[in-house]
């Protein structure tokens, strides 16, 4: 397992939420991604292929997530303080094997510009 | 100095059974991906087997269910159990250090990049 | 599965002249997982280039890889009577994990 910051932008704020980039190799047929607040698990995308390279996607631990070719966005809204902490991509590579193990992330600063319902 | 060490080859009949043995040196054995590669005389090159550093096994089509790499980190040993086997199966087993990195969105393949010198396993009647 | 052909089968040529070996993939690979070995009779075969075009340590600089897609080339600027062997295209895939081509024969006309 390697363990590192993100070398790209990985929160981007919108409309008093965030968006946690995490992407992931484009040589990567079938994953785990696990959005990890600290040690605890938020959020899970799993991407299978079936016969006939049909893609399966699942997850046990339900975001709203978005899927592309080479990362997955996880969404966060009504952000308050409590948010900040550090957020980490725990991406699980089935195929291509052998399996793999690697953790990407980087600490979430929320200021007040960012928060979702500022007192007037 | 890297380097992988082969035996226990040698001629065994048509549904008997043999296990190689590999000894690396001279580098951290735990964090490399094995395989082992074979090439029957005057043939190409035919990847066999592989064993993840996770422990977890893959094998090519024509040995699944009589081939079985394993590993022992302890011991810094790659081994492969051959059962059942075959007249086909008569070629030179190679051990194999697999270099691959992950990090984060990238993935490097560095290629297979140290061999034993081979182990010779004939079976024949 | 992936398919690598390589060709020609076999390659004449003479010491100072220029090798152009050829590994043609079934349908298209990454640059990344791309390899090339040598191996010489008797011996082990030995890594030349990885990641399509980068040189393994120790191999020197008349070896060069490039390609993209389904066609890659081994290219030996001019021949040293050392480098007369067979070379082989590998590729990291899903399944099998490991596939190589069949090899090209450089031999000595």
């Known amino acids: 397992e390697i363990n590192g910051s993100a070398n790209y932008e990985m929160f981007i704020f919108h409309n008093g939420g965030v968006q946690i980039l995490c992407k992931y190799p484009d040589i990567v047929q079938q994953f785990k991604m696990q959005l990890l607040k600290g040690g605890q698990i938020l959020c899970d995308l799993t991407k299978t292929k079936g016969s006939g390279n049909t893609v399966s996607i699942k997850s046990l631990k339900f975001c709203h997530s978005q899927l592309s070719n080479n990362s997955v966005s996880f969404f966060l809204y009504n952000l308050d303080h409590s948010h900040a902490n550090y957020y980490f991509c725990n991406l699980s590579i089935f195929d291509p094997p052998p399996f793999k193990v690697t953790l990407t992330g980087g600490y979430l600063h929320i200021y007040e510009s960012q928060l979702c319902c500022q007192l007037k | 100095e890297v380097q992988l060490v082969e035996s226990g080859g040698g001629l065994v009949q048509p549904g008997g059974s043999l296990r190689l043995s590999c000894a690396a040196s001279g580098f951290t054995f735990n964090g490399y991906d094995m395989h082992w590669v074979r090439q029957a005389t005057g043939k190409g090159l035919e990847w066999v087997a592989l064993?993840?550093?996770?422990?977890?096994?893959y094998y090519s089509d024509s040995v699944k269910g009589r081939l079985t790499i394993s590993r022992e980190n302890a011991k810094k040993s790659l081994y492969l159990q051959m059962n059942s086997l075959r007249v086909g199966d008569t070629a030179v087993y190679y051990c194999?250090?697999?270099?691959?990195?992950?990090?984060?969105?990238?993935?490097?393949?560095?290629?297979?990049?140290?061999w034993g010198q081979g182990t010779t396993v004939t079976v024949s009647s | 599965e992936i398919v690598l052909t390589q060709s020609p089968g076999t390659l004449s040529l003479s010491p100072g002249e220029r090798a152009t070996l050829s590994c043609r993939a079934s349908q298209s690979v990454s640059t990344s997982s791309l390899v090339w070995y040598q191996q010489k009779p008797g011996q082990a075969p030995r890594l030349l280039i990885y990641g399509a075009s980068t040189r393994a340590t120790g191999i020197p600089d008349r070896f060069s890889g490039s390609g993209s897609g389904t066609d890659f080339t081994l290219t030996i600027s001019r021949l040293e009577p050392e480098d007369f062997a067979v070379y082989y295209c590998q590729q990291f895939g899903s399944s099998p994990p490991i596939t190589f081509g069949q090899g090209t024969r450089l031999e000595i006309k």
């Open positions: 194999v250090r697999d270099r691959r990195a992950v990090a984060g969105h990238y993935y490097y393949f560095y290629g297979l990049d140290v």
């Open positions: 064993i993840g550093t996770a422990g977890d096994t």
